[in-house]
Amino acid sequence: HKSSSQGQDRHMIRMRQLIDIVDQLKNYVNDLVPEFLPAPEDVETNCEWSAFSCFQKAQLKSANTGNNERIINVSIKKLKRKPPSTNAGRRQKHRLTCPSCDSYEKKPPKEFLERFKSLLQKMIHQHLSSRTHGSEDS
């Protein structure tokens, strides 16, 4: 039970870290290539992980201007790191009925990042709701 709880905590930490990285990138939105990217919104239940992978696959890029290029590139790279898997995530990977990435509305980097953050927050909330007891921080 303890290792399962630690796994849950690791997952929660990773999702929370992704939000912090998104917030960091939002500070540099003017230094990103103003390209339109698929940005899932109002994702249907059980398609969260599919939408998450669309955000991770999107070609967010630094405009290579100014002093911020390194921090932007590191942040983008960290956003693409695979989070610890959960049972819900494993189950959703087998769903074939979720929309393809290309079918989602394309948005510029600012809105793309805002929608990514909203999805991450939704996933954290779902994750917490599925836990019946125990502290996230113990």
């Epitope: 690791r10 929370r16 917030d23 927050q121 909330h125 921080d137």
Partner: antibody, heavy 117, light 106 residues
Framework: QVQLVQSGAEVKKPGASVKVSCKAS????????MHWVRQAPGQGLEWMGL????????IYNQKFKGRVTMTRDTSTSTVYMELSSLRSEDTAVYYC??????????WGQGTLVTVSS | DIQMTQSPSSLSASVGDRVTITCRAS??????LNWYQQKPGKAPKLLIY???RLHSGVPSRFSGSGSGTDFTLTISSLQPEDFATYYC????????FGGGTKVEIK
């Protein structure tokens, strides 16, 4: 058990720099990011930033950008916070706090930094 | 930046009293709110995370509620060890603390 042990009190002159350390034990160091928070005498808590202990990625409070540098040494499970161009308003207790899943779950004992000419 | 405003800044109460502290965010932070307790000369300790969830080892007399911009920390029956300063903290966008509420003995 999780422990965060910080370095001792420091007295610095205005314009100088200070480097505070925070040694972690009781868990896998690189599994958890670390926050730094400060508290001026009789005042509230102020978030300074955080560091990814696995690869020194940092996110700083805009207020301290350009003056604060957070680093780490994985061989000793220690994180560092350096603040430069010190002024009297930087007199405060500086805390490290572990980045738990949704909160700062463990805190160091604090390091008092006094800036005085 | 998200500002957090706590009220009152201090209050006097007796052992056994029900105490309520409020925290208001300058914008919607959903449930992304934590509460910490700090005693003089000590580091803060986590009490409640994600608005209403009790951190391990925290007595059940502590509870949290709210959503959006308005949040409450309640101590149902104040104990001698509860006299301290309490801080709310948002983690919707990076981190910001409230100014603190000092709970003193009446």
């Amino acid at each position: 058990q999780v422990q965060l042990v910080q370095s001792g009190a420091e007295v610095k002159k205005p314009g100088a720099s200070v480097k505070v350390s925070c040694k972690a034990s009781g868990y896998t160091f690189t599994d958890y990011w670390m926050h730094w928070v400060r508290q001026a005498p009789g005042q509230g808590l102020e978030w300074m930033g955080l560091i990814d202990t696995s690869d020194v990625y940092t996110i700083y409070n805009q207020k301290f950008k350009g003056r604060v540098t957070m680093t780490r040494d994985t061989s000793t499970s220690t994180v560092y916070m350096e603040l430069s161009s010190l002024r009297s308003e930087d007199t405060a207790v500086y805390y490290c706090a572990r980045y738990g899943p949704l909160a700062m779950d463990y805190w160091g004992q604090g390091t008092l930094v006094t800036v005085s000419s | 930046d998200i500002q957090m405003t706590q009220s009152p800044s201090s209050l006097s109460a007796s052992v056994g009293d029900r105490v309520t502290i409020t925290c208001r965010a300058s914008q919607d932070i959903s449930n992304y709110l934590n509460w910490y307790q700090q005693k003089p000369g000590k580091a803060p300790k986590l009490l409640i995370y994600y608005t209403s969830r009790l951190h391990s080892g925290v007595p059940s007399r502590f509870s949290g509620s709210g959503s959006g911009t308005d949040f409450t920390l309640t101590i149902s029956s104040l104990q001698p060890e509860d006299f301290a300063t309490y801080y709310c903290q948002q983690f919707h966008t990076l981190r910001t603390f409230g100014g603190g509420t000092k709970v003193e003995i009446k």
